[in-house]
Structures are given as C-alpha cells and as structure tokens.
Amino acid sequence: PGPPPGPPRVSPDPRAELDSTVLLTRSLLADTRQLAAQLRDKFPADGDHNLDSLPTLAMSAGALGALQLPGVLTRLRADLLSYLRHVQWLRRAGGSSLKTLEPELGTLQARLDRLLRRLQLLMSRLALPQPPPDPPAPPLAPPSSAWGGIRAALAILGGLHLTLDWAVRGLLLLKTRL
C-alpha cells in the first residue's frame, strides 16, 4: 500500500482571497494616481490623451450591478495584461524623458504583474474556467517623438487608473455575493 493520505487540503476562503486581491488592486490604484500626478507635474499637457491600442473601459459604474464573477475576472485579467504590456513598452521605448519616472514605473510594472498572478490564483481557487492562452499581440510601434512618449504615458496611466477604479468597485460588489 502507498503512503497514508495526508491531511485534507483546506481550500482557502474565497472571500479572503478576494480581499487580498482588492487590497492589491487598491494599492495599485493609489500608485497609479500618484504616478500620473507626478507625470502631469513634470510634463504639463492639456486635454485627454488616448492610445488606440489600449483596451476600452470594461464597464460603467452604473452597470456594476449586472456583474458575474467569471466575466469580471476574465475581463479584468485581459485588460491588465494589456496595460502590463503597455507599461513594459513605455519603459523600453518611452525615451529619455520618461527615465525620470524610474524606479516608479518599474515598481508599477512589478505590482501589476503581482496583481495578475493574484487574479490567476483567484480564478483557479474559485474553480473558474481558465482563459485560453493569450494570442500573440502585435508589437507596439515606438512613440514618434519624446512628446509622443509622454502623451502615451499619460494615456496609459489614465486608462489604468480608470480600470483599477472599476475593478475595486466590481470586486467589492462581487464579494457580497460569494
């Protein structure tokens, strides 16, 4: 006979898992807000800044009531993967102007990566269907100028802030349904 079975694995409380995800998301939200403020101080720029390659905002605040957990986590993970790719691109191709935002951009990238791993873990703990592997994304073209890099950075941080704000609200609402 084989070795005696070990003690049964205690499945972590999904609400506690969701709590730690909310904390990570909120921390990243504050980081993003502060970094965007720093960037605007260093490079004042009027108006809204857009980047076509960024994901569209997942959900309006008014539509939060209709959320379902699998859909939220899958969409959030996809959007955050896109933002991670954009932050990596920014650090690589953003130009010398954005070097003044190191190490903050590096910290942001590391925390974004940590949040993505946390979401992946949460999805497996909740036995949600795992999303298919991400198709290779087309490479992002380098900014046309230093000013283009700054505008791209403002767009990325602005979009990430909105996405994370939506995520915190959504995750807290979903927690009440678990």
Epitope: D19, V22, L23, L24, R26, S27, L29, A30, D31, R33, Q34, A36, A37, Q38, R40, D41, K42, P44, E104, L172
Partner: antibody, heavy 120, light 108 residues
Framework: EVQLVESGGGLVQPGGSLRLSCAAS????????MHWVRQAPGKGLEWVAY????????YYADTVKGRFTISRDNAKNSLYLQMNSLRAEDTAVYYC?????????????WGQGTLVTVSS | EIVLTQSPATLSLSPGERATLSCSVS???????LHWYQQKPGQAPRLLIY???NLASGIPARFSGSGSGTDFTLTISSLEPEDFAVYYC?????????FGQGTKLEIK
C-alpha cells in the same frame, strides 16, 4: 526645521470671500504636495484640498468643490486657499499640512492654524 | 468615500495603564495608507504613526500601530501624563482623504 505659518483668517459674512496663505520654510517646498485641513470648533479634522508640487493635479473635498481654490507659488514658498461663497459651516481653524513624502499621503508637518469665522 | 469609525469615543485611563484605540474602515485599505495623529487642546495635530505601524520621527516607542484590511489599532503601552489628548486615524488611499471622528483619551 520645517515650518508652516498660516495667515489670512478672520471674520467674514456669509457669501463673502477670504484668501488664506501658508508660508513654508525649512524644506524644499517645490518637492512636496501640500494640503489644507480644517477643524470646526469642538469637532474633528476634515481634509479640504490637495495640490501636487507642480500644481498640475488638484483634489477637493465635495463640501468645498466649486467654492474653494487651492494654489501655490513655489518661487515664494507659499500655499494659498481662495475661499468664495463662504457659509456658516465653513467656520473652522484651517491648517496647511505637508505630505510625508511624494508617495504617502500622511500629513507629516502642520502649521499652527488660522481661524476663519463666517457669521453675520 | 471611505468612512473611518473610531472606538471608543472616550477612553478614561490612568497614567501607567495600557491604552488601545481602534479604527474601523468601511472598505478594505492597504495598511501603508492608514495613519494616526495626536492632537492636544489648542495645538495642531501631529503625525504619530504612518503606514499603520511605522513610528513617525521623534515619537516615543511606547506608541505602536497594527492592523490590516479594515481593522487598525493604536496602542500606548504605558500612559504618560502628556499622552492624554485626542487621537485620529486617517486614510490616504482614496480621494477624498478622510479622518475618523477621533477618540478622546482622558485621565481617570
């Protein structure tokens, strides 16, 4: 030594205006975000407004939005709060405060406060 | 808006005793954004603890902070006469930045 000194408080009628100033010394003023926090007589603390070092990001409490304007002059090491359309409930001691660091919103240093009284 | 609720509203203790003040937060917040202040009558507040558990410069070691998520605590291990004051917790993770309503620590 970090010093923050507020001035400009006083008695004003409802609907009136007042401009508070905060003179900063002992640190590189242009490197830190600054806040205004107020305290009504016998009450708790209420955050009012925040401005980043370069003035390009500003936040206000909902209670003062559209009536108060925070600004700064880094060349003069000064922070300002322009208060318009004043109401009785704006009566308070107003403190200027410096953030702890650029990545933490704790209020590390405070002025002694200036009293604003809104009354007819 | 994130709401901070402090308890008790008033705490009556004697010098030498241990004081435990609580701050309950309406939403989960990362601990690095929870701060504690002390205010004495007629004076400006002063930062005691930042990031839930870090002692601010010049603050005696009898003060300590702990907690995470929604529940945070300020502890004064052995009360000195000068510790009797009002204590506020504050969050800086979300705008508007908000304070608790305060706990008054008074001499018994």
């Amino acid at each position: 030594e970090v010093q923050l000194v507020e001035s400009g408080g006083g008695l004003v009628q409802p609907g009136g205006s007042l401009r508070l100033s905060c003179a900063a010394s002992g640190f590189t003023f242009s490197s830190f975000g600054m806040h205004w926090v107020r305290q009504a007589p016998g009450k708790g603390l209420e955050w009012v407004a925040y401005i980043t070092p370069g003035s390009n990001t500003i936040y206000y409490a909902d209670t003062v939005k559209g009536r108060f304007t925070i600004s700064r002059d880094n060349a003069k090491n000064s922070l300002y709060l322009q208060m318009n359309s004043l109401r009785a409930e704006d009566t308070a001691v107003y403190y200027c405060a410096r953030e702890y660091s650029s990545y933490d919103e704790g209020f590390a240093y405070w002025g002694q406060g200036t009293l604003v009284t809104v009354s007819s | 808006e994130i709401v901070l609720t402090q308890s008790p509203a008033t705490l009556s203790l004697s010098p030498g005793e241990r004081a435990t003040l609580s701050c309950s937060v309406s939403d989960l917040i990362p601990s690095q954004y929870l701060h504690w202040y002390q205010q004495k009558p007629g004076q400006a507040p002063r930062l005691l603890i930042y990031g839930a558990s870090n002692l601010a410069s010049g603050i005696p070691a009898r003060f300590s902070g702990s907690g995470s998520g929604t529940d945070f605590t300020l502890t004064i291990s052995s009360l000195e006469p000068e510790d009797f004051a009002v204590y506020y917790c504050q969050q800086g993770v979300d705008v508007p930045f908000t304070f608790g309503q305060g706990t008054k620590l008074e001499i018994k």
